[in-house]
Interface confidence: low
């Protein structure tokens, strides 16, 4: 059963998943000028067992102009509502990033994929929030939302995050580390379709970040 809504919107914040629970589907969609190959998969599926999870199927697309050229890309069920999208990366040379049991990392990129990746989440999926550039995070509690099943209905928990004010120019957005949520664990497993924008976050999936000062500017 799909989650009825997107995760809650927090002013001046974005959210994303750090890993995807088994059962999550990623639609295969192509960027403009390309289309999914006729025999290609509609979606990738996160599958596995207790020790290893991976994405089944491959997204492929071909130039709209030619019939034979095969290029890789992402899927799109016709009936789906337009939602936000989540962006992540998949490891080529992993850098001390622990894998979460029962979860998949972001599928590797493919040529000519669409700019957005649309996921069908399952119950128990967690997304993490962080303030965007220029806003400071004030935590009242966990800066995350979980797709939960309650009384036969799906819902997203409310993240306890407020993004306020201007930050010093030398700092990065949302440097605070989100607290671990006691309710961020799967209960039942039903699909939720959700997507999120890209941002930086520190979680159990990521090695601890040390605060450093960098300068940002336009070229």
């Amino acid at each position: 059963e799909l989650c009825d809504d997107d995760p809650p919107e927090i002013p001046h914040a974005t959210f994303k998943a750090m890993a995807y629970k088994e059962g999550t589907m990623l639609n295969c969609e192509c960027k403009r000028g390309f289309r999914r190959i006729k025999s290609g998969s509609l979606y990738m599926l996160c599958t596995g067992n207790s020790s290893h999870s991976s994405w089944d199927n491959q997204c492929q697309c071909t130039s709209s102009a030619t019939r034979n050229t095969t290029k890789q890309v992402t899927p799109q069920p016709e009936e789906q509502k337009e939602r936000k999208t989540t962006e992540m990366q998949s490891p080529m040379q992993p850098v001390d990033q622990a894998s979460l049991p029962g979860h998949c990392r972001e599928p590797p990129p493919w040529e000519n994929e669409a700019t957005e990746r649309i996921y069908h989440f399952v119950v128990g999926q967690m997304v993490y929030y962080q303030c965007v550039q220029g806003y400071r995070a004030l935590h009242r509690g966990p800066a995350e939302s979980v797709c939960k099943m309650t009384h036969g209905k799906t819902r997203w928990t409310q993240p306890q995050l407020i993004c306020t004010g201007e930050m010093e120019t030398s700092q990065f957005p949302g440097e605070e580390k989100p607290q671990a949520s006691p309710e961020g664990r799967p209960e039942s497993e039903t699909s939720c379709l959700v997507t999120t924008t890209d941002f930086q976050i520190q979680t159990e999936m990521a090695a601890t970040m040390e605060t450093s000062i960098f300068t940002t500017e336009y070229q």
Epitope: T85, S90, V95, V132, A207, S212
Partner: nanobody, 134 residues
């Protein structure tokens, strides 16, 4: 196969310059932020510079500001790191890394950028050696 390949490293005298290249294959860099990192012998890998594909904005480590610059050539699927006024302490293996950027759905998300933290990047090249010595 997804690959990042660095080139352009070598031996250079203090005060000299080098231009490193990071070429991507198997995917296009259009939707990616690219970071350059370095690792000196016996030290941890550290961030040097990163650049956003969406607006060309960059992050500089304070230690290289004014000396190193980063640029990208999307049609060539390549990112460059220009190293000027090199010092012996710049000696290290230099790595490039890629991070996919989101479509920035929210109106406030247009300037969400990528800082130089290792765990923000998952695609890494094999590195190129830069040695600064007289």
């Amino acid at each position: 196969e997804v690959q990042l390949l660095e080139s352009g490293g070598g031996l250079v005298q203090p005060g000299g310059s080098l231009r490193l290249s990071c070429a991507a294959s198997g995917f296009t860099l259009d939707y990616y932020a690219i970071g350059w990192f370095r690792q000196a012998p016996g030290k941890e890998r550290e961030g040097v510079l990163s650049i956003s594909s969406t607006d060309g904005r960059t992050y500089y480590a304070d230690s290289v500001k004014g000396r190193f610059t980063i640029s990208r050539d999307n049609p060539k699927n390549t990112v460059y790191l220009q190293l000027n006024s090199l010092r012996p302490e710049d000696t290290a293996v230099y790595y490039c890394a890629a991070k996919r950027l989101g479509p920035m759905v929210h109106q406030y998300s247009l300037e969400v950028l990528t800082p130089l933290f290792l765990d923000e990047y998952d695609y890494w090249g094999q590195g190129t050696q830069v040695t600064v010595s007289s």
